[in-house]
Interface confidence: low
């Protein structure tokens, strides 16, 4: 019995299509492919950034894959043919590995790039970046801004940039539309007469960096003798109720109650008679139904009761 | 460790529905594959559906195209299998599996090597 051989993939690349991380990797059929007219031949690609412990892997019978990476670091990847059991009349059969690289040539010493480098989209409506100029760079120094997302079509450079002393320092983006629920890509690079910039690079996912408006309408109700309603209602905006987790902090008689974190608008206290002042404030956050991560509010406006008994009165701010 | 813990099974008529439910637990990447199998008496493990929690691309069976859905749930961790027109050649032990080294689900044909994470599995029973 002769042994089945089977060769690699011909042209392996990675292809860089200007969407600041998100590259193609692609290839041809491996050569002499005749004898398995009737297989279907399957690839074995494997790929990370350099450093990383861990290889991504996928099958397919495709040609090409898509992936986002991040671009501050070089990318390897390698791929090998797949000969199934079917077509081999017993054990599946791979082929050597074909390999190759990419990693855009760094511009700059590492401290030129900028530092700090901030994003917030507030109330899934807005979205703000910022960030610090890079270490020692000069004055004449200016950092530009470019996103991608998928649904455009190419690379956008920032039109509203918000600016320290005639440097830009931070971004205020547009309407981003179909924009969350999936990587969103920023390359910020710079250009000085003096010295070279070095390029930054940035991947998040525009629903875990939510910074929501603070709960309104902060109520009382007395429930019994012994227990009082705390209720407030969500923020205007487009974020839905059961998106939202709540943090309460309650003083009774200047002494911090209670701090708690609960998942609808309202929260039972117990207290005394004795109560001479109660105050409470709120603060809210996605929770983790609608993101993996998130930024807390600000606190509301203080509601306080003061004096009168609560027993038939219900507070409003 | 990953731990698997399947439910929904059971026993209904043919042309019912039932919903099958898999959480995962004791993992820690955001990039991996889950998937539903099954094995009927006598027969050998077949590939039902996957769903990649990264792209969410599915991929399905020609048996139960059109009539099962796989989705994921909001905690990303937890996989359902919707059956609906079930027939009484769905009978099986169906199992959940999953795969954290991978990001995309394979095609049908080859998923029996592509998961290294297995369920107990839970019984459906389609009969009058």
């Known amino acids: 019995d002769t042994e089945i051989k089977v060769n690699p993939p011909q042209d392996f690349e990675i292809v860089d299509p200007g969407y600041l991380g998100y590259l193609y990797l692609q290839w041809q059929p491996p050569l002499s492919l005749d004898h398995f007219k009737e297989c279907t031949v399957e690839y074995e690609l494997k790929y990370r950034n350099i450093g990383s412990e861990t290889w991504k892997t996928i099958i397919t019978k495709n040609l090409h894959y898509k992936d986002g990476f991040d671009l501050n670091k070089g990318i390897e990847a390698k791929i090998h043919t797949l000969l199934p059991w079917q077509c081999t009349n017993g054990s599946e059969v791979q082929s050597s590995w074909a390999e190759t690289t990419y990693w855009i040539s760094p511009q700059g010493i590492p401290e030129t790039k900028v530092q700090d480098m901030d994003c917030v989209y507030y109330n899934w409506q807005y979205l703000l970046c910022s960030w610090k100029p890079g270490i020692g760079v000069l004055l004449d120094t200016n950092y530009n801004l470019f996103y991608w997302y998928e649904g455009l079509d190419h690379a956008l450079q920032c039109v509203d940039y918000i600016k320290a002393d005639g440097q830009n320092i931070g971004c205020r983006f547009p309407y981003l539309e179909a924009s969350d629920y999936k990587d969103f890509y920023i390359c910020v690079n710079g250009s000085s007469e003096n010295k070279p910039i070095r390029s930054s690079y940035f991947t998040f996912q525009l629903q875990n960096i939510v910074k929501p408006l603070p709960p309104v309408y902060l109520t009382f109700t007395r429930e019994s003798s012994c227990e009082i309603k705390l209720k407030w209602s969500i923020p205007l905006g487009p974020i839905p109720a059961r998106c939202f987790d709540y943090e309460i902090e309650i003083r009774e008689d200047d002494t911090t109650l209670v701090t708690a974190t609960v998942e609808n608008e309202t929260y039972t206290l117990k207290t005394t008679n004795e109560t001479r002042q109660l105050c409470f404030v709120v603060r809210s956050k996605v929770n983790i139904y609608c993101s993996d991560d998130g930024i807390w509010s600000e606190w509301s406006d203080k509601q306080c009761w003061e004096g009168e008994d609560l027993s038939k009165k219900t507070l409003l701010r | 460790e990953v731990q698997l813990v399947e439910s929904g099974g059971g026993l209904v008529q043919p042309g019912g529905s039932l919903r099958l439910s898999c959480a995962a637990s004791?993992?820690?990447?955001?990039?991996?594959?889950m998937g539903w199998f099954r094995q009927a008496p006598g027969k050998g493990l077949e590939g039902v559906s996957c769903?990649?929690?990264?792209?969410?691309?599915?991929v399905y069976a020609d048996s139960v195209k059109g009539r099962f859905r796989i989705s994921r749930g909001n905690a990303k961790n937890t996989v359902y299998l919707q059956m609906s027109a079930l027939r009484p050649e769905d009978t099986a032990v169906y199992y959940c599996?999953?795969?954290?080294?991978?990001?995309?689900?394979?095609?049908?044909?080859?998923?029996?090597?592509?998961?290294?994470?297995w369920g107990q599995g839970t019984q459906v029973t389609v009969s009058s």
């Open positions: 599996a999953m795969d954290s080294r991978r990001v995309t689900c394979p095609e049908i044909s080859t998923m029996h090597r592509n998961f290294d994470s």
């Open positions: 004791g993992f820690a990447s955001d990039d991996y594959i």
């Open positions: 769903i990649s929690s990264r792209y969410a691309n599915t």
